[in-house]
Amino acid sequence: DSSKWVFEHPETLYAWEGACVWIPCTYRALDGDLESFILFHNPEYNKNTSKFDGTRLYESTKDGKVPSEQKRVQFLGDKNKNCTLSIHPVHLNDSGQLGLRMESKTEKWMERIHLNVSERPFPPHIQLPPEIQESQEVTLTCLLNFSCYGYPIQLQWLLEGVPMRQAAVTSTSLTIKSVFTRSELKFSPQWSHHGKIVTCQLQDADGKFLSNDTVQLNVKHTPKLEIKVTPSDAIVREGDSVTMTCEVSSSNPEYTTVSWLKDGTSLKKQNTFTLNLREVTKDQSGKYCCQVSNDVGPGRSEEVFLQVQYAPEPSTVQILHSPAVEGSQVEFLCMSLANPLPTNYTWYHNGKEMQGRTEEKVHIPKILPWHAGTYSCVAENILGTGQRGPGAELDVQYPPKKVTTVIQNPMPIREGDTVTLSCNYNSSNPSVTRYEWKPHGAWEEPSLGVLKIQNVGWDNTTIACAACNSWCSWASPVALNVQYAPRDVRVRKIKPLSEIHSGNSVSLQCDFSSSHPKEVQFFWEKNGRLLGKESQLNFDSISPEDAGSYSCWVNNSIGQTASKAWTLEVLYAPRRLRVSMSPGDQVMEGKSATLTCESDANPPVSHYTWFDWNNQSLPYHSQKLRLEPVKVQHSGAYWCQGTNSVGKGRSPLSTLTVYYSPETIGRR
């Protein structure tokens, strides 16, 4: 049952005279709350007396009595889990063992904590990585096994006695696991830091020095080299001699091998600190450096640029860009190996010197077709003039020029003709590969650049063609000027605006939409009979007899076109009324007699009225008046009246004679 009490705290705490000590502590007594607590200094159990001998630094008992030392020593814990302690200030003679005598309802316990108090502030400890290499970031750690809330401290980093400008991260731990103050400094050492002294200085809150730790940096680095050359400017002419010397200014660890490099490539059999070049050629121009290696790696010196001077070599021309598009810009570059660089250039176009062009580059801002041809140049420096090289060819490309659309037919062109057109151009680079035509149609292209329009339409007005290489150039549209007979001929009534009544003045117009040529003649006809040759046909006073089917014709030199037949309708009041009798105007009594009102009217008669010899209207309104059986009294004169939307008309009198039958006569 010894597992009933569980304590957690640092095993040993460190401090110095006049500082303080903060002891983080937790506990657990499973059988209930704490009843009393006594803090002993160096408790020793006396078996004889069954008591602990030692100084009581703090006492918290059931009766609540506490010693005066309690002002310096404080129990900051509680009755069930916290047993944290503070001693402020802490003295040298506080070193030793602290005994926490604790009592619960059922048990007593003594927990021991070690306290190490030094006379003066003890130094922090600098921790370095096992190996430090130049330019590789390392973390320097300064650790001090001390932290106390009542005694603030700071850790400062110094390099050769000067504060380091890198930002350090300071952290403190006051936990049951550990008590410390730590400063971490991220630092990228350079080779020049090798052998330098780094100090971690412990200071109080006011920056007063308390203690320190120092280490000497061992920065592993590649050899650091200096190169010397004779002549010092490293500029020589072909045939001269050159000496280069390599000096090691620092290496950690010691160097092992030496080599020389030209333009990044190792020189064979050159493994000493001196490089001698005798009777140099221009091929020996380049960047030289020495390379010395140690276990860290190779170190290289700065590069020496050896310049072996010579007259320009035969030149070549580079064109940016060929082929060039007309209107674009082109740059010509004269390339000639020379040392020193050429100071003057002469340019040639198709073998002829280009005046005023003395630069390495020739820039033509707007290329034209005549700029095409061969370009060459000559370079010149202080040592001489080079030779003219083979030159470069400039190809200038442009769209087809002066494109025209040509009509091959004899003029004029008539509707329905077959028309042939050709697309012509003056020049083109690259060659024309295709043609385009506007507008598009289902037309034949019997050969490249030729268009055949079968059965040309009256409305084919203009045609344009394009000749195409990489670009298309369009010709101006050409007018076909197709001639055709008048179109859309129709009869149009001008007046009256409403329906035609008998007696009206009437005008008819012969209209057409278009005609080419424009000169036309008109013809009017009714039932095959020619009526007039004007665009209008006029009636001063129209009569019903003028009604009928009219057509007009329009013709030009190409042909003539007829309108659709147009019906002229004349409205008039009933006329030519007469009463006809059936079976005749003499009828025997008892038989049947039918009187019919006949008339001529447009529109037809809509309403009839019958009258007798006394002009008395009869109650009959249909076209036929039927008398059955007819009586002698029906004898007399009858007339009728017809009405339509235009007006009325009346018939003359017609007499009906009804005679007696033989029976009637026999009775008499």
Partner: nanobody, 127 residues
């Protein structure tokens, strides 16, 4: 309230025996330590013998080892059998009871600062 009462003391000749008894009342803990202490005139009180209830482990002062025997019963009463008594064993004998005491996990058989004490009983060894 815990009450302890010692009995069995008295006057005995050197080499003689006595059996001290301690009766406990009002003590409720299941785990405890009982002990016998003595105080001779002009001297500090000293532990004579202790016994632990949990494991029955006993403690004897060097001066009584082999002569005295401590025991207990289930009623929380303890006994000290004293044989081969010597004049220097003359003292007032006290009975004490307390909770177990651990020091960093080590259980003391004779705990520190016993909380409950008897009135004491005189033992005199004299010829």
């Amino acid at each position: 309230q815990v009450k302890l009462e010692e009995s069995g003391g008295g006057l005995v000749q050197p080499g003689g025996s006595l059996r001290l008894s301690c009766t406990v009342s009002g003590f409720t803990l299941d785990s405890y330590v009982m002990g016998w202490f003595r105080q001779a005139p002009g001297k500090e009180r000293e532990a004579v013998s202790c016994i632990s209830s949990s494991d029955g482990v006993t403690y004897y002062a060097d001066s009584v080892k082999g002569r005295f025997t401590i025991s207990r019963d289930n009623a929380k009463n303890t006994y000290l059998q004293m044989n081969s008594l010597k004049p220097e064993d003359t003292a007032i004998y006290y009975c004490a009871v307390d909770k177990p005491f651990y020091d960093g996990g080590y259980l003391y058989t004779c705990p520190v600062d016993f909380d409950s004490w008897g009135q004491g009983i005189q033992v005199t060894v004299s010829s």
